[in-house]
Amino acid sequence: SGTTNTVAAYNLTWKSTNFKTILEWEPKPINQVYTVQISTKSGDWKSKCFYTADTECDLTDEIVKDVKQTYLARVFSYPAGHVESTGSTEEPPYENSPEFTPYLETNLGQPTIQSFEQVGTKVNVTVQDEWTLVRRNDTFLSLRDVFGKDLIYTLYYWKSSSSGKKTAKTNTNEFLIDVDKGENYCFSVQAVIPSRRTANRKSTDSPVECMGHEKGESRETGHHHHHH
């Protein structure tokens, strides 16, 4: 069955980072357009991206309503220019997406080191808490608000003069590490959800930040550099 001269979508793929969630599919349309529907397992279908010639649809607004639900989407194909005249008795061809559970499957975005501060032989490294599009009432929630203690950060640090890396972990957004006096160190962090068992349990590493550059501050030297 299906509507004349339309091809069903295929390769439906969820692309999601920090809950920003886009459904992508193929093929690039030739004389056809698409409409996407999304639902939870127990809910009704909701249509989005009506009669679009794109091959992607931003479904963030839907999935952030409950990031712990499991969602299914489907993409309908319609002949371009004949959308309204499609016979109501004939269902257009469509393809289902894989199931998607945002809380378990959204990728962790690349974290950012907000600041570091040296006091004697201790350095406090702070990771910036990223905002998401998940809301509570009318307030946007941070990554930490959503994941809580499920989310940890791993810090990689090393002397600027050597390549031997050390690691530290925290379930907050701060590290307090011991360093050698008079040595400059470089830092990189990674977000991790240890309870995940798949490839998306870790983010990519943050950009490297090194002492002696703009991001930190040192009480030893009296130079204060604040990063905003």
Epitope: L104, D129, S142, R144, G148, K149, N171, N173, S195
Partner: antibody, heavy 120, light 113 residues
């Protein structure tokens, strides 16, 4: 409606094992931690640990490591607590609870509790 | 482990009274990332499971009456019942929901005077 329904009371002899079940309904079982809490008669609450059904990932209170085991069967949306080598001090009500929607937002839903009595 | 200490252990009060229960933690429960305090309050009545009242130190769980309020930051927290109702006589527990192992206070039993 979210519900956690626990198995019935158990009377066990010292040295035996017990397995308490917690059947969840009304929500996506795999995405919420199931917490286990012990309450001895007339005493306060003691967190035993938790399990995330999606991955089977667990956290244990050191006081219960070794004798308590958490498991979950996602096909029937049920979590289990098994305690081996039972002692008199294991006599208690055991609760399962579900974590809140937001991060670190408490135990939002609780089972009715299962009384385990250990007596010779 | 984070120790949670509640005071008083028991308290007698009358309907209509304003009641305050305090909870101290041995370490800060303030999350630097989002500036939230991961302190939770529960109410438990005899023979029943505990009920979540307050999370994030001051956020009321949906359906909890507005006479219950939570405050505090870092290591010092308070649960206040502005005007006691007959159904409020119960035992109240605070909980560290910040870091493993999660720990409860020993409880405060609120009795009718």
């Amino acid at each position: 409606e979210v519900q956690l329904v626990q198995s019935g009371s158990e009377l066990k002899k010292p040295g035996a094992s017990v397995k308490v079940s917690c059947k969840a309904s009304g929500y996506t079982f795999i995405t919420y931690w199931i917490e286990w809490v012990k309450q001895r008669p007339g005493q306060g609450l003691e967190w035993m640990g938790d399990i995330l059904p999606y991955s089977g990932s667990t956290n244990y209170n050191e006081n219960f490591k070794g004798r308590a085991t958490f498991s979950a069967d996602t096909s029937v949306s049920t979590a289990y607590l098994q305690i081996s080598s039972l002692k008199a001090e294991d006599t208690a009500v055991y609760y399962c609870a579900r974590s809140g929607y937001y991060g670190n937002s408490g135990f939002a839903y609780w089972g009715q509790g299962t009384l385990v009595t250990v007596s010779s | 482990d984070i120790q949670m200490t509640q005071s008083p252990s028991s308290l007698s009060a009358s309907v209509g009274d304003r009641v305050t229960i305090t909870c101290k933690s041995s370490q800060s429960l303030l999350s630097s990332g989002n500036q939230k305090n991961y302190l939770t309050w529960y109410q438990q009545k005899p023979g029943k499971a505990p009920k979540l009242l307050i999370y994030w130190a001051s956020t009321r769980e949906s359906g909890v009456p507005s006479r219950f309020s939570g405050s505090g930051s870092g290591t010092d927290f308070t649960l206040t019942i502005s005007s006691l109702q007959p159904e409020d006589f119960a035992t109240y527990y605070c909980q560290n929901d910040y870091t493993y192992p999660l720990t409860f206070g020993q409880g405060t039993k609120l009795e009718i005077k």
